[in-house]
Interface confidence: medium
Amino acid sequence: CPGACVCYNEPKVTTSCPQQGLQAVPVGIPAASQRIFLHGNRISHVPAASFRACRNLTILWLHSNVLARIDAAAFTGLALLEQLDLSDNAQLRSVDPATFHGLGRLHTLHLDRCGLQELGPGLFRGLAALQYLYLQDNALQALPDDTFRDLGNLTHLFLHGNRISSVPERAFRGLHSLDRLLLHQNRVAHVHPHAFRDLGRLMTLYLFANNLSALPTEALAPLRALQYLRLNDNPWVCDCRARPLWAWLQKFRGSSSEVPCSLPQRLAGRDLKRLAANDLQGCAVATGPYHPIWTGRATDEEPLGLPKCCQPDAADKASVLEPGRPASAGNALKGRVPPGDSPPGNGSGPRHINDSPFGTLPGSAEPPLTAVRPEGSEPPGFPTSGPRRRPGCSRKNRTRSHCRLGQAGSGGGGTGDSEGS
């Protein structure tokens, strides 16, 4: 056993060396180690094959060091590794795309607070067993296409506290099991209408504290299981272009935050959800540095980047747009998806309402958190709700013009790569 470490065999073969002032990965770690705890030291570099002898390793904690470099082959041979915690290494900044290759059993990967500025191509390739991916509190500015494509079992993705300015079409492709997506406290100004296409099992979506002034309801349509949605602290523009989102929120059977309007001035601070349909009139004039919501054909956009507003005919320029009645959104399913429809990432079987950690269910629209976390798992997700259908575009009956609201065929199909401020 290395000098600064404590080694023991029960309940698992463990080499524990936390907060010992180590400046390098110690030599002489027992080859039989199943768990290695090296957190809280001064380790700056993980050389190639540092743990190659530890074929039975399942848990490796290297968090809270001063890692600046991890060799691409640092974790070679760790085919049984299940948990890897590299968090709180702010000098790391980048990770070689090959670093995690071969970790086919990895189910939890902590890369939060690592100063990461980008996710290299193929960084998460082959991590088919991954269930929890912590990427929060980094300096990520973009979500490259297909970054998470191989993560078909991922249930929790934490991306909050970064500098992400847009959510492109292919950012979340392949995440068919995703239960929780935390994107709050970023700079997101644009969500592509198809960005969430694969997220049919998503139950929790946090987009609060971003730079959104609109959100295409087409993006929300695939979220059949969505139960918790937070959209507060964004510069929402509550004019005719917000009608589809307003209609969607009226029909949403889960729990959602307030959606406070920024524009027009007369509605500033009011909750979009609590407005009447006829409050959402005309076009708000931008007075602030609003960012593109999506990029489309130039003729379908205003300089703001918002979708083009409902415009009266040339002969009727002086008139104020009258709100049309929102088109029927179809019959949103009343019942919930059965609890087992979106199984917990830990494979412990279906979740039921009675599994609530708090034990009681205060209201039918507010299902509780689910509870039991088997050993080795991460905290739980939420029960699911029934699917909802996207509302249609509102038409101004007495003119030929109609709303451009970012739905299919309305000029809202670009990828949108605008920068946040």
Partner: antibody, heavy 124, light 107 residues
């Protein structure tokens, strides 16, 4: 500066009711689950009740279930504990505590801020 | 409910000593364990979260380790101000449960 200021404790007879309040400041109350923890004289800590950020999930220890009700008013940054059918064994110092919970952070951080405590004495 | 068993129930040690407190869960709780320090007449103070993460402002002589069912709080080089009662708390599922406490006294 972060503060959790409690009130509402005192002496009450068995079978009667009390309502505890916890008014917070210095942080975004909306983002946190909140809890009540109590400590009987000379004893250890006991979790009493918890409520999620949006009141969507609420729970109680078996010892108080059916008698105590936790609630919150996010517009007033306030947490409440309504205690009915009080018993002698409910005598304790009651603390409110902030839980920087997993729903917001991705980590469970524990109860990182506590109120000053308020003494509830149940006696005839 | 998950039972948390702390040992020892009390310990007396000298300034500069290393003190170890253990906490055992009745079932596996992954890393979801917190440690608190409480001094007489005061509210508890969070020391360690998620088994091994030091809360901001807590001296480096405190450290936590463990996973699953067995956890340890270590105070390296005990200081006079460390005289207090220490509690573990499982946060794996509700109801959250505390250990019965370990009283640390300075000889």
């Amino acid at each position: 500066q972060m503060q959790l200021v409690q009130s509402g404790g005192g002496l009450e007879q068995p079978g009667r009711s009390l309502r505890l309040s916890c008014v917070t400041s210095g942080f975004n109350f909306n983002d946190y689950a909140m809890h009540w923890v109590r400590q009987a004289p000379g004893k250890g800590l006991e979790w009493v009740s918890g409520i999620s950020w949006n009141s969507g999930a609420i729970g109680y220890a078996d010892s108080v279930k059916g008698r105590f009700t936790v609630s919150r008013d996010n517009s007033k940054n306030s947490l409440y504990l309504q205690m009915n059918s009080l018993r002698a064994e409910d005598t304790a110092v009651y603390y409110c505590a902030r839980d920087y919970n997993y729903e917001i952070s991705g980590y469970y951080y524990g109860f990182d801020n506590w109120g000053q405590g308020t003494l509830v004495t149940v006696s005839s | 409910d998950i039972q948390m068993t702390q040992s020892p129930s009390s310990v007396s040690a000298s300034v500069g000593d290393r003190v170890t407190i253990t906490c055992r869960a009745s079932q596996g709780i992954s890393r979801w364990l917190s440690w608190y320090q409480q001094k007489p007449g005061k509210a508890p103070k969070l020391l360690i979260y998620a088994a091994s993460n030091l809360q901001s402002g807590v001296p480096l002589r405190f450290s936590g380790s463990g996973f699953g069912t067995d956890f340890t709080l270590t105070i390296n080089s005990l200081q006079p101000e460390d005289s207090a009662t220490y509690y573990c708390q499982q946060t794996n599922n509700f109801p959250y449960t505390f250990g019965q406490g370990t009283k640390v006294e300075i000889k």
